[in-house]
Interface confidence: low
């Protein structure tokens, strides 16, 4: 059928990997607080997945606020190189393979894989779409490669680690992790799926910006929002190409100070999720 054909249309943009944060406060919105000072601070932006500048009012706010770009990166972005090197050299499972499955605080219900230390195999679980822990893989193969034992009791493949000829160090090679991203598509592509208020059950697609994919959902027939497409391809056309890699890896995206005062002491769950 035509939708089957559409399925194989080439979308060249890199898919976003799962969002895995070190601390839950990294998912909070930038909160300038109720005071009127103009102080340059940094916060971790869950949409662009990087630390960015914002203007802090000087009081209250939340924990997603750092004095320097370096401090923000240290707290909210993962550098797993040391752990990867250690596990590769010692042929051990990474520590996170032994963590319990963690759905996180959001409500996307994405099928993911985790290593179950009881059964010694990778299994599916429901991931909410944000936070959680690193025992969380997009594909079964990735989970098996990292956490399951190979036939000889060793890991099958530890992140594709290879020797870097420049500094003779081990470097993790990953095709999945993008560099810096900006979203230039329609703003509604960043909103959650919204069933609306009626009682129908229509098959629709919405763009899940956490995982960078279009997923099906049930639309009630009225209301809702614009992140609502009748086909997967229409969804991809509208939203997928919005994620583009930044040309320059330097510089910061500035967040304008809000004119109208809004209390935004809310976690990612409220940003991204609507009770339906």
């Amino acid at each position: 059928d035509s939708e089957e054909d559409e399925e194989h249309t080439i979308i060249t943009d890199t898919e976003l990997p799962p969002l895995k944060l070190m601390h839950s406060f990294c998912a909070f919105k930038a909160d300038d607080g109720p005071c009127k000072a103009i102080m340059k601070r940094f916060f971790f932006n869950i949409f662009t997945r990087q630390c960015e500048e914002f203007i802090y009012g000087g009081c209250e706010g939340n924990q997603n606020r750092f004095e320097s770009l370096e401090e923000c990166k240290k707290m909210c972005t993962r550098d797993n190189a040391n752990r990867i090197i250690k596990t590769t050299l010692q042929q051990e499972k990474p520590d996170f393979c032994f963590l319990e499955e963690d759905p996180g605080i959001c409500r996307g219900y994405i099928t993911r894989y985790f290593y179950n230390n009881q059964t010694k195999q990778c299994e599916r679980f429901k991931y909410g779409g944000c936070l959680g822990n690193m025992n969380n893989f997009e594909t079964l193969e990735e989970c098996k490669n990292i956490c399951e034992d190979g036939p000889n009791g060793f890991q099958v493949d530890n992140y594709g680690t290879q020797l870097n000829a420049v500094n003779n160090s081990l470097t993790p090679q990953s095709t999945k992790v993008p560099s810096l991203f900006e979203f230039h598509g329609p703003s509604w592509c960043l909103t959650p799926a919204d069933r609306g208020l009626c009682r129908a059950n229509e098959n629709r697609f919405y763009y899940n910006s956490v995982i960078g994919k279009c997923r099906p959902f049930k639309y009630s027939g009225c209301g809702g929002n614009e992140n609502n497409f009748t086909s997967k391809q229409e969804c991809l056309r509208a939203c997928k190409k919005g994620f583009i890699q930044r040309i320059s890896k330097g510089g910061l995206i500035k967040t304008k100070r809000k004119r109208k005062k809004q209390r935004v002491k809310i976690a990612y769950e409220e940003i991204f999720v609507k009770n339906m």
Partner: antibody
């Protein structure tokens, strides 16, 4: 109209292997997972495993991981389940079903095949 | 594995009366307000048919006399008023994680 059409009744000898099919139509085959469920006569339903036809990722119940092998051929919109080393305990009706993922509502089986009856007998 | 225990195993209900079927999970199947418990109806010689998903949501085309409720570990399927065509076996099923599991089934007879 969404349909899952399963292959017909199979009679097999103990120790043999069988492969049954589930042909999907009326929707994009690669978008939805296909699950397999076993039902022995007069008994309940047992989940065997599931396959994502889009990339052939398969996941199995611990109980069936050495018994069943799930595959899919996207060009034919067909999922397959192969059962090996058959015993009398494998005699059952086997259903394929489509898993629907609807965001906030979780996921579940919205369409089922009519079932393939397997009888293992010497 | 999550074990789903259905009760009763069978029940006979008079036409027009209420049928109540219970399903208890060995651990919670709810995450952040979504209840990953679903109900199916199966008639002899037929595959199961989805009735209720996410504990309480009625599948399209299913009569409104079917309703579901519950959260965490305790779920209920209600049929009211019961009709002749409702004679069948009813199964609950959870999808919070692999392996997906089903309840043992409840056979409903109409008196």
């Amino acid at each position: 109209e969404v349909q899952l059409q399963q292959s017909g009744t199979v009679l097999a000898r103990p120790g043999a292997s069988v492969k049954m099919s589930c042909k999907a139509s009326g929707y994009s085959f690669t978008t939805y997972w296909i699950h397999w469920v076993k039902q022995r006569p007069g008994q309940g339903l047992e989940w065997i495993g599931a396959i994502d036809p889009g990339n052939s990722d398969a996941t199995y119940s611990q109980k069936f991981k050495d018994k069943a092998k799930l595959t899919a051929v996207t060009s034919a919109s067909t999922a397959f389940m192969e059962l090996n080393s058959l015993t009398n305990d494998d005699s059952a009706v086997y259903y394929c079903s489509r898993e629907v993922y609807y965001g906030y509502d979780g996921d579940y089986f919205d369409y089922w095949g009519q079932g393939t009856t397997l009888t293992v007998s010497s | 594995d999550i074990v789903l225990t259905q009760s009763p195993a069978s029940l006979a209900v008079s036409l027009g009366q209420r049928a109540t079927i219970s399903c208890r999970a060995s651990e919670s199947v709810s995450v952040h307000g979504t209840h990953l418990m679903h109900w199916y109806q199966q008639k002899p010689g037929q595959p199961p048919k989805l009735l209720i998903y996410a504990a309480s949501k009625l599948e399209s085309g299913v009569p409104a006399r079917f309703s579901g409720s519950g959260s965490e570990t305790d779920f209920t399927l209600n049929i009211h008023p019961v009709e002749e065509e409702d004679a069948a076996t009813y199964f609950c099923q959870q999808s919070i994680g692999d392996p997906w599991t089903f309840g043992g089934g409840t056979k409903l007879e109409i008196k």
